[in-house]
C-alpha cells in the first residue's frame, strides 16, 4: 500500500509568491512558492494519486506583513482552503502568546493541530483542552495513519508561550502516544514536528513504532540528485536513520518559506512496515501556475496590507544580505545596518564627557529573517523590513558587566557551524574568534567603542566595567540561550519597535549602503 506524504515547514507567512531567496517577489516570472502555486501542485498530486496526506511541520506564523496585520487568521484561512490534513505546532505559533494561537488558529482550523510534548496546566488547561491534540488517526482510503506531533522543547526560550504550558522532552513524550496508537491497531505512524533535524533523527532512532519523521525548525534542505535551486542539500531525501530496533526510518524536511513542497512516497507492507521510500522536494517555481481562485482570494486579503506597507521609506544601493547562510556564520551587512540604526535611535544624552550614552549593539543573527534585493529600484518599504524583522519585538537598552558580554560572545560561537541563531551581529564592537579553540574559550579579542571620549575609538573590554548595550528584547529575555544576559543584567529599559527603529533610520538616511567592514573576524 502506497502513501504519498506532501509536506511543508517553516513557511513563515509566505502566503504570496516570493523571489528565489524568499524575500518579496520582484519579477513575477522568476518568483516561487506562495499558497496559490502550492494549491495547484497539491491538487495535481491529489488527482493523480490515491492516498495523499498534506502535512505542515510548524512555523506558519511570523515572517511577513501578512502575519503583522492578520496575526494568524490568514494561516487558518488559507490552510483550510488548501485542505491540510494536519499541522504540528512550531515555536513561532506562540509569538503572540497563547491567546494569539488559540483565537486565530486553533479555533478556526478545520484540520487537527498536534503536539504530544506540550502539556497545559493551571487555568489554561481547560481553556485549551481539545484545541490541540497529541495525535490524530487519519483515514486514508480504507487504511488509517496515525500522526503524532511534537514541538521544540526550547520554545519557552524562543517565543512567548507563557507560564502555563510545559514543553517536555520530545522522545519521552512521544513514546507513550505511539504505544497508545499501536494498541489501537494503528500500524502506520508518522511523527510530525518542529524541533530541528538533529532531534528528528533522534526521534527516528529512539521512538519505537515511528515509521516516518516529517520535521521542521532547522530549515533543512534534503535532496537526492542535482538540486534545482540555490539550496545545498544537507543529505539525501529521504534521509534514512537506522532505528535502535533495526528498522530504516525515513526522515524528511522541506527547507522553508513555501519554496518547496516535500513529496515522499512510502510503500507499506501488510504489517505496516516501510518497505520502500523515495521522493524529493518539488521546487514551486513559475513553471507551476498559481491557482486562479486562491490567487483571487490572496488579492482580496492583500488590499488591507497595501496601505500599511507599500510606502517607500528610503533606498538602498547595495544588496542587504540578511540570509541565514551569512548572518548565522559571519558579519553580514544587514546586521550592520540594523545595529547602526539601533545606535542611531539612541543618540541622546551627549555632554562634554560622553559623545553618547551608548555605543554598543548586539543582535542575534537568527533574528534577521530575510535579505532585501537592491534590484527593485532600491526601494525599501515597511513590508520589506517586516520580512527582515518579523517578530514585532523591541530594541531595548540594558546595562551589563564586561564579563557578561564576554560570556555572550562565547555563547555566540559555542556550537558554530550549525546555522544556529545565536551568532551575534554587532555595532560598536570588534570581536575576533579562534574557532580552533574549544567552546567557551574562542573569543581572543573583544574591543568596544568608547563612549566617554570626544573621538570614538576601540578599547579592550574590561571585565568589571559596566556597559550600556542596545539589543533585541528577545536577547534581554534570555532568548537563543543567552541566559547570562537575562540573569546578569543590571538594568533593562524597554525600547522602540524594531521595524520602526530601522525604518526611521532609513528614512533619515534616505540612501543607504552598509558594508561588511571587519567588525567580526
Amino acid at each position: 500500500w502506497e502513501l504519498t506524504i506532501l509536506h511543508t515547514n517553516d513557511v513563515h507567512s509566505r502566503l504570496e509568491q516570493t523571489s528565489e531567496d524568499s524575500s518579496k517577489c520582484v519579477n513575477a516570472s522568476r518568483c516561487m512558492g506562495g499558497v496559490a502555486r502550492l494549491f495547484t501542485k497539491v491538487q495535481q498530486i491529489r488527482r493523480a494519486e490515491p492516498n495523499v496526506l498534506l502535512l505542515d511541520a510548524g512555523d506558519q506564523y511570523q515572517g511577513t506583513i501578512w502575519f503583522t496585520v492578520y496575526k494568524g487568521a490568514e494561516v487558518a484561512h488559507f490552510m483550510n482552503a488548501l485542505r491540510y490534513d494536519a499541522m504540528a505546532l512550531g515555536n513561532h505559533e506562540f509569538d503572540n502568546g497563547v491567546e494569539g494561537l488559540i483565537e486565530p488558529l486553533l479555533k478556526e482550523a478545520k484540520f487537527p493541530i498536534l503536539s504530544a510534548n506540550i502539556k497545559a496546566k493551571g487555568p489554561l488547561a481547560s481553556q485549551i483542552s481539545g484545541l490541540y491534540l497529541p495525535y490524530k488517526v487519519l483515514p486514508v482510503g480504507d487504511e488509517v495513519v496515525g500522526i503524532v506531533g511534537y514541538t521544540s522543547k526550547e520554545t519557552p526560550f524562543l517565543s512567548n508561550p507563557g507560564t502555563n504550558l510545559v514543553f517536555e522532552d520530545e522522545i519521552t513524550a512521544l513514546q507513550p502516544e505511539v504505544d497508545k496508537l499501536k494498541t489501537l491497531n494503528v500500524n502506520k505512524i508518522i511523527a510530525l514536528g518542529h524541533s530541528g533535524f538533529e532531534t528528528d533523527k533522534l526521534i527516528a532512532q529512539k521512538v519505537r513504532g515511528v515509521d516516518v519523521v516529517v520535521g521542521g525548525h532547522s530549515n533543512t534542505f534534503l535532496y537526492t540528485g542535482n538540486p534545482p535551486s540555490k539550496e545545498v542539500p544537507a543529505g539525501k531525501y529521504p534521509f534514512i536513520v537506522t532505528s535502535d530496533d533495526g528498522r530504516k526510518v525515513p526522515v524528511v524536511q522541506a527547507y522553508a518559506f513555501g519554496k518547496y513542497l516535500g513529496y515522499l512516497k512510502i510503500e507499506f507492507d501488510e504489517r505496516g512496515n516501510v518497505i520502500s521510500s523515495h521522493g524529493n522536494p518539488i521546487l514551486l517555481n513559475s513553471s507551476i501556475p498559481e491557482d486562479p481562485s486562491i490567487k483571487a482570494d490572496i488579492n482580496k486579503w492583500r488590499i488591507k496590507l497595501d496601505n500599511y506597507s507599500t510606502q517607500e521609506l528610503g533606498k538602498t544601493i547595495v544588496y542587504l544580505d540578511g540570509s541565514s547562510q551569512s548572518c548565522r556564520f559571519r558579519e553580514c551587512n544587514m546586521g550592520n545596518l540594523i545595529c547602526d540604526a539601533m545606535i542611531n535611535n539612541n543618540l541622546r544624552h551627549a555632554d562634554e564627557m560622553f559623545w553618547n550614552h551608548v555605543s554598543m549593539c548586539i543582535l542575534n543573527g537568527g533574528g534577521i529573517r530575510s535579505p532585501i534585493d537592491e534590484r527593485n529600484n532600491g526601494t525599501i518599504t515597511w513590508e520589506n523590513l517586516a520580512a527582515v524583522l518579523p517578530f514585532g519585538g523591541t530594541f531595548d537598552l540594558v546595562q551589563l558587566k564586561g564579563s557578561t558580554l564576554k560570556k555572550a560572545f562565547e555563547h555566540s560561537v559555542h556550537r558554530y557551524g550549525q546555522s544556529t541563531g545565536e551568532f551575534l551581529q554587532v555595532g560598536g564592537i570588534h570581536v575576533v574568534y579562534d574557532l580552533s579553540r574549544k567552546p567557551g574559550d574562542r573569543v581572543v579579542k573583544l574591543d568596544v567603542l568608547c563612549t566617554k571620549c570626544r573621538v570614538p575609538s576601540y578599547d579592550p573590554l574590561k571585565m568589571d566595567e559596566i556597559y550600556k548595550v542596545i539589543l533585541p528584547n528577545f536577547l534581554a529575555n534570555g532568548g537563543d540561550g543567552f541566559q547570562m544576559i537575562k540573569d546578569e543584567l543590571l538594568r533593562h529599559d524597554s525600547g522602540d519597535q524594531d521595524i520602526n527603529v530601522v525604518s526611521t533610520y532609513i528614512s533619515k538616511m534616505k540612501v543607504i549602503y552598509p558594508a561588511v567592514e571587519g567588525r567580526i573576524k
Epitope: 500500500w1 482510503g141 487504511e143 533495526g246 530504516k248 507492507d269 501488510e270 518497505i275 523515495h278
Partner: antibody, heavy 112, light 107 residues
C-alpha cells in the same frame, strides 16, 4: 496479526485441474498484492504471478500464463490459484505470499 | 527478468561462528530486497526487508547490508536453530525473482 492460511494437500490425476485457496486476515485484503510461488525439491523457488484483490488485476510469469489462473474473493478475503492440465511436473509445494508473510504451503501431488 | 545469484549454495559452520550469505542482482533493485528463512517444515519467515530493516521478533544477530549490487545477510553468532535454508528475494519489479538458496549446515 497478518496471516495467510492455505488449503490442505491435494492428490490429483494427470490432466485434471485443482484450485488452491489462501485466506488472508489481519490486514486490509484489497490493498496488497498476493503472489504465488512454486517450490519443487532441489529446484528453488519460482514466481507464478500476482493478483491485486482491490481491482482483480493479475500478472503472470511467462512460464505459467497458460497453467495458472489467479482470482480473489474480496467478501471472504480469499485468493485462489487454479492450475489446469496437470502433469507430474506440477507436483510441488505452492505458496501464497505477501511482502511480509507467507502461507504455510499447499502440497500438490499429481499421480495416476 | 532480474537475476539473483546467491552464494554459497551450502555452507558448513559451527555454533557461535559469524557467517555471511550474498546475493548479486543483475540489474538495479535499489533497496528492495528481502531475506527469507525456510524452516525444515517448509514454512517461510521474513528476516530482513528493504535490504537492512530487521523484522520485529527477529533476533539482532541477523543483519542485512548492501554494497553496490551485492546484498548480504550476516548472522553474527550462529545458534542451533539457524541451521536451515535462506533465500533472497527482489521485489523491485515483477516477476519477483529469488536467489537459488543457501543451505546452512552445522559443522
Amino acid at each position: 496479526q497478518v496471516q495467510l492460511q492455505q488449503s490442505g494437500p491435494e492428490l490429483v490425476k494427470p490432466g485434471a485441474s485443482v484450485k488452491i485457496s489462501c485466506k488472508a486476515s489481519g490486514y486490509i485484503f484489497t490493498n496488497y498484492y498476493i503472489h504465488w510461488v512454486k517450490q519443487r525439491p532441489g529446484q528453488g523457488l519460482e514466481w507464478i504471478g500476482w493478483i491485486f484483490p482491490g481491482s482483480g488485476n493479475t500478472k503472470y510469469s511467462e512460464k505459467f500464463k497458460d497453467k495458472a489462473t489467479l482470482t480473489a474473493d474480496t467478501s471472504s478475503s480469499t485468493a485462489y490459484m487454479q492450475l489446469s492440465s496437470l502433469t507430474s511436473e506440477d507436483s510441488a509445494v505452492y505458496f501464497c505470499a505477501g511482502l511480509s508473510d507467507w502461507g504455510q504451503g499447499t502440497t500438490l501431488t499429481v499421480s495416476s | 527478468d532480474i537475476q539473483m545469484t546467491q552464494s554459497p549454495s551450502s555452507l558448513s559452520a559451527s555454533l557461535g561462528e559469524r557467517v555471511s550469505l550474498t546475493c548479486r542482482a543483475s540489474q538495479d533493485i535499489g533497496d528492495r530486497l528481502i531475506w527469507l528463512q525456510q524452516e525444515p517444515a517448509g514454512t517461510f519467515k521474513r528476516l530482513i526487508y528493504a535490504t537492512s530493516s530487521l523484522d520485529s521478533g527477529v533476533p539482532k544477530r541477523f543483519s542485512g547490508s548492501r554494497s553496490g549490487s551485492d546484498y548480504s545477510l550476516t548472522i553474527s553468532s550462529l545458534e542451533s536453530e539457524d541451521f536451515v535454508d535462506y533465500y533472497c528475494l527482489q521485489y523491485a519489479s515483477s516477476p519477483w525473482t529469488f536467489g537459488g538458496g543457501t543451505k546452512l549446515e552445522i559443522k
